[in-house]
Amino acid sequence: MRTEAQVPALQPPEPGLEGAMGHRTLVLPWVLLTLCVTAGTPEVWVQVRMEATELSSFTIRCGFLGSGSISLVTVSWGGPNGAGGTTLAVLHPERGIRQWAPARQARWETQSSISLILEGSGASSPCANTTFCCKFASFPEGSWEACGSLPPSSDPGLSAPPTPAPILRADLAGILGVSGVLLFGCVYLLHLLRRHKHRPAPRLQPSRTSPQAPRARAWAPSQASQAALHVPYATINTSCRPATLDTAHPHGGPSWWASLPTHAAHRPQGPAAWASTPIPARGSFVSVENGLYAQAGERPPHTGPGLTLFPDPRGPRAMEGPLGVR
């Protein structure tokens, strides 16, 4: 999912020494802010293809576009892993590949992409609108998961182009790693910007996007970098298996959820942003999540309607057990 930058365009400041200084002190933070938000933003793409020869056969291909090293890939169907989805395969770059029916063959295609062939008949057979999800655990980014399904009208043998799905699974490892440093930098830069409030403010060009957009500025990458705006969690649930994703019950939770830009999960107003994403409009549903680590062995409560925590299994020691090297 791509979106335009919400960084406002700056008009040239007044000439003179103070104007030059103001230009420098304002432009530099904005440039740094843009870099800060876009730097190292990984992306996961999912491609689902129905084989022409066997109508009950699917090929799922997933890839990770990021600089970190992948420590585990989990493929599930019927929803994200650990959120009602059923695990089909687990691929570790060194420890091996595990798969369960109807998965027939899981394999690494490259060091950052995998493929999975599914076949089945009867109860375990995937149907045309099943949602398939791929979760990549990587260091230092954390866990990133994307889901995809066949477009409703797709013909056998055809497939949707690989598309980055609008999903973020930022584990504590990633957040406290590079992301944490970048976030701190962003906050600091915003603080610098606020200090310049007393100076004559440059004229801002009106935003061409939704009224929500200004609130998401700090989270929006630049158009030039082509980085994806990753929502804490957004997926289309079109599974023919019983859908369990949208049954989150509010039980209260940590107050910092309020600061998450959950509005970013909603469909942008501009037509271009979703144009390349073959997501069926019917039966769609959006939920928001951020896969933070919980205490080892503990699964935190659901946090508000549509806000669900999906922790990785073994606490704050990132990438453990099947999640990778310890």
């Epitope: 650990g82 059923t86 695990t87 089909l88 687990v90 570790h92 770059p93 060194e94 420890r95 091996g96 590949i97 595990r98 369960w100 029916a101 109807p102 394999r107 690494w108 295609e109 490259t110 060091q111 995998i114 375990s124 080892a296 062995g297 699964r299 922790p311 990785d312 299994p313 073994r314 057990g321 099947p322 310890r326």
Partner: antibody, heavy 114, light 113 residues
């Protein structure tokens, strides 16, 4: 800490069935698969099969397909292996292991009596 | 099924000696997509469950002493103990982690001279 608890021993008559348990604790049971391994006295290890909690389609070694049935009970975080039509050949030590074999149970010694 | 063949079946060594044991697979354990070999080594002491030593043919499991080294690719693999200690006396198994069923070798028994 992570633990896989298995009963120490099972004594069963030939021709009968036995259901062995492997109770997991110290981690999120549904996030790791369980593998079962057989070891006859003084012999090597044989991979029986594995099962992922939440996925009702275990993998089996062809050799054990008509012998072993793997199941899980997520509510009690317990994995089970049922062995049917027992013979003396089934007398062995049976281990359960988690995920990529990072944790093992102490094993259940099955003795099939005639 | 992939057949794993270990040799020798037993080794008599003195403490401090360097030891190597072999494991051959009937099919390649190399994953062409990421160029990784899916082979694991286990150590089993009497009365204990096996303990994972090496995975990915050469990566030591955390907590495993660095005197244990795994090497090899494709179908030929080796486990080396640079300086055998008394606590290393055990049976060592290699395992195909590449495809189902995940077959084990028959083991190499390490004994003291």
């Amino acid at each position: 800490q992570v633990q896989l608890q298995q009963p120490g021993a099972e004594l069963v008559k030939a021709g009968a069935s036995v259901k062995m348990s492997c109770k997991a604790s110290g981690y999120t049971f549904t996030s790791y698969w369980i593998t079962w391994v057989k070891q006859r006295p003084g012999q090597g290890l044989e991979w029986i099969g594995d099962i992922y909690p939440g996925n009702d389609s275990p993998n089996y070694n062809e050799k054990f397909k008509n012998k072993a049935t793997l199941t899980v009970d997520t509510s009690s975080s317990t994995a089970y292996m049922q062995l049917s039509s027992l013979t003396s050949e089934d007398s062995a030590l049976y281990y359960c292991a988690r995920g990529y074999y990072d944790y093992w149970g102490q094993g259940t010694t099955l003795t099939v009596s005639s | 099924d992939i057949v794993m063949t270990q040799s020798p079946s037993s080794l008599s060594v003195s403490a401090g000696e360097k030891v190597t044991m072999s494991c051959k697979s009937s099919q390649s354990l190399l994953n062409s997509g990421n160029q990784k070999n899916y082979l694991a080594w286990y150590q089993q002491k009497t009365g204990q469950p096996p303990k994972l030593l090496i995975y990915g043919a050469s990566t030591r499991e955390s907590g495993v002493p660095d005197r244990f080294t795994g090497s090899g690719s494709g179908t030929d693999f080796t486990l080396t103990i640079s300086s055998v200690q008394a606590e290393d006396l055990a049976v060592y198994y290699c395992q195909n982690d590449h495809s189902y069923p995940h077959t084990f070798g028959a083991g190499t028994k390490l004994e003291l001279k």
